[in-house]
Interface confidence: medium
């Protein structure tokens, strides 16, 4: 239904608190370098204006679109060109081109320092003094570093943050209470960020149809008792919601997400038997709970997939009459039977089925041609299953850090041209798949591993797109989204790469490494490992093990020495010489 004032409509639907949070996220994701104080001033102005429109929808400018209102606010910022360069050129455009221009200038890797968590005492003091401002800072800091973060979900994480601080700041040992709880929120939020970026990439590169196929597969796995029409409705709504959030329409996105949660809770009987616990929660928690809901039980008496899609004499007729609907029902039927497959795999199978029908329905004897299609799925299924088996075995043998190092060596050999920080970040994230997925029951491993790896590789692609340096990475990244992971897995040592010359300063360390937190220490060592591989791409596992073992001993020894600086200065060159020799 059309509203006289879009902004008044959203303010009334969302309520002041969520409205302000979403406007702050929107501004922080568009203008990532602006300080919190500047954004909060704009948020207050927009909120005051929205209240004016709630009081009188006919008031001046209340009929303007939200993009127009937000864009005008951003373009009125003084010194916009000084701080943002060519982004200021967007302001010369009219809507909707202006918003498109803003979106194109979002930076996935903004030049911002890593978000440092304050000391527990300091954090509690500032939280207790002004909780609203404290949580506002949280939204701002996360949103500017993750310009595609799913806005309503970020509000949920801020709520979690609030709960943790409320609980822990009354404890005597605040740090002991806060650290594990905030670490858990951070870990979940970082995974959510890469997953959402993947959704936006899918939408941007391949359009709504591709995203909707993803949603159909996912929903069918979760709700195997829902009928195809119900799954189609849910997938259509989820596609619209994600399109809005990826497109910067955060108020509409959050409003529609709340509407979808309401619909699902009102229609539990036709969707899933598992929804009730979620439906008793307040809006943000309800939506989040529904998004993370466990799979419903698969109906006991499902007929073989072959009946409708191989043995039926009308397969080609049904396909020709309504291709998308027929393929949609295939994806639905296959997915609801296979919660143990990744969405990427299900989409590859649907693609294979489509290609088979395209070929076979044009031939003389279609049933004979497509009769073996389900058997032809076998190699497509086996490939990711083997990937999970070998990688989880390696993870169990090496532990998380060792597994990250193995992945880092592998990926540096595949794409040595990629910058070391990007390779280290990717390998650390890829390596976490072990901890995240390999401890799960067998039936949950494959979907966990492959869909997580796909999201991490999408981040690698997004960063590489900004400064393309490897033809192999470009090739894997420009293909279909569901083929990316198999494409990367199939890459071997890049034979075209000319090894980097050995630079002693790359492997020169100082006593400051001793005081670094464990994570930073690991990153330093992994940076050295990547540089070693770039110097000797064909180094054997044993050679690398020797050098890295030697390096770890050196750091350990010097950090324990009375005169640390002297130890690093004298032992360092010896280490470099031994490493060169070991790799010769």
């Amino acid at each position: 239904e059309a509203h006289k004032s879009e902004i008044a409509h959203r303010f009334k639907d969302l309520g002041e608190q969520h409205f302000k949070g979403l406007v702050l996220i929107a501004f922080s994701q568009y203008l990532q370098k602006c300080p919190y104080e500047e954004h909060i001033k704009l948020v207050q102005e927009v909120t005051d204006f929205a209240k004016t429109c709630v009081a009188d929808e006919n008031a001046e400018n209340c009929d303007k679109s939200i993009h127009t209102l937000f864009g005008d606010k951003l373009c009125a910022i003084p010194k916009l060109r000084d701080n943002y360069g060519e982004l200021a050129d967007c302001c010369a455009k009219q809507e909707p081109e202006r918003n498109e221009c803003f979106l194109q200038h979002k930076d996935d890797n903004p030049n911002l320092p890593p978000f440092q968590r304050p000391e527990a005492e300091a954090m509690c003091t500032s939280f207790q003094e002004n909780p609203t401002s404290f949580l506002g800072h949280y939204l701002h800091e996360v949103a500017r570093r993750h310009p595609y973060f799913y806005a309503p979900e970020l509000l949920y994480y801020a709520e979690k943050y609030n709960e943790v601080l409320t609980q822990c700041c009354t404890e005597s040992d605040k740090a002991a209470c806060l650290t594990p709880k905030l670490d858990a929120v951070k870990e979940k939020a970082l995974v959510a960020a890469v997953r959402q970026r993947m959704k936006c990439s899918s939408m941007q590169r391949f359009g709504e149809r591709a995203f909707k196929a993803w949603a159909v597969a996912r929903m069918s796995q979760r709700f195997p008792n829902a009928e195809f029409a119900e799954i189609t409705k849910l997938a259509t709504d989820v596609t619209k919601i994600n399109k809005e959030c990826c497109h910067g329409d955060l108020l509409e996105c959050a409003d529609d997400r709340a509407e979808l949660a309401k619909y699902m809770c009102e229609n539990q009987a036709t969707i899933s038997s598992k929804l009730q616990a979620c439906c008793d929660k307040p809006v943000l928690q309800k939506s989040q709970c529904l998004a993370e809901i466990e799979h419903d039980n698969i109906p006991a008496d499902l007929p073989s997939i072959a009946a409708d899609f191989v043995e039926d004499k009308e397969v080609c007729k049904n396909y020709a009459e309504a291709k998308d609907v027929f393929l949609g029902t295939f994806l639905y039927e296959y997915s609801r039977r296979h919660p143990d497959y990744s969405v990427s795999l299900l989409l590859r199978l649907a693609k294979k089925y489509e290609a088979t029908l395209e070929k076979c329905c044009a031939e003389g004897d279609p049933p004979a041609c497509y009769g073996t299609v389900l058997a032809e799925f076998q190699p497509l299924v086996e490939e990711p299953k083997n990937l999970v088996k070998t990688n989880c075995e390696l993870y169990e043998k090496l532990g998380e850090y060792g597994f990250q190092n193995a992945v880092l060596v592998r990926y540096t050999q595949k794409a040595p041209q990629v910058s070391t920080p990007t390779l280290v970040e990717a390998a650390r994230n890829l390596g976490r798949v072990g901890t995240k997925c390999c401890t799960l029951p067998e039936a949950q491993r494959l979907p966990c591993v492959e869909d997580y790896l796909s999201a991490i590789l999408n981040r690698l692609c997004v960063l590489h797109e900004k400064t393309p340096v490897s033809e192999k990475v470009t090739k894997c990244c420009s293909g279909s989204l569901v083929e990316r992971r198999p494409c990367f897995s199939a890459l071997t040592v890049d034979e075209t790469y000319v090894p980097k010359e050995f630079k002693a300063e790359t492997f020169t360390f100082h006593s400051d490494i001793c005081t670094l937190p464990d994570k930073e220490k690991q990153i330093k060592k992994q940076t050295a490992l990547a540089e070693l591989v770039k110097h000797k791409p064909k180094a054997t596992e044993d050679q690398l093990k020797t050098v890295m073992g030697d390096f770890a001993q050196f750091v350990d020894k010097c950090c324990k020495a009375a005169d640390k600086d002297n130890c690093f200065a004298t032992e360092g060159p010896n280490l470099v010489a031994r490493s060169k020799e070991a790799l010769a």
């Epitope: 009928e227 195809f228 029409a229 409705k233 036709t270 409708d308 029902t329």
Partner: nanobody, 118 residues
């Protein structure tokens, strides 16, 4: 081409029964939610009932609950509506409808007239 053909309508006395049938062709019947909609003289369309593709879930308007029963036979591509304890206010043209999107319907039959009168 999608076709929905209703039959079974007619004149019946209050308290009587009728069974409507709808024969479908031109699409894979077993994949779709099907339903019945009615339009009383001079009134708007009113949902009567719908049924899931596998027949496991049915919906009824409050005005017909306990009196009408929807069912389907996927092997015969046929939808049924058993109407018992009919009342004068059930007089209407009854349409069979095919769903494409949860409770949205894209194809309708020509309708069959049910008249309840003494």
């Amino acid at each position: 081409e999608v076709q929905l053909l209703e039959s079974g309508g007619g004149l019946v006395q209050p308290g009587g029964s009728l069974r409507l049938s709808c024969t479908a062709s031109g699409f894979t019947f077993r994949h779709y939610r099907m339903g019945w909609v009615r339009q009383a003289p001079g009134k708007g369309l009113e949902w009567v009932s719908w049924i899931r593709p596998d027949g496991t879930f049915t919906y009824y308007a409050d005005s017909v609950k306990g009196r009408f029963t929807i069912s389907r036979d996927n092997s015969k591509n046929t939808l049924y509506l058993q109407m018992n304890s009919l009342r004068a206010e059930d007089t209407a043209v009854y349409y069979c409808a095919k769903s494409y999107h949860a409770d949205k319907f894209d194809y309708w039959g020509q309708g069959t007239l049910v008249t309840v009168s003494s």
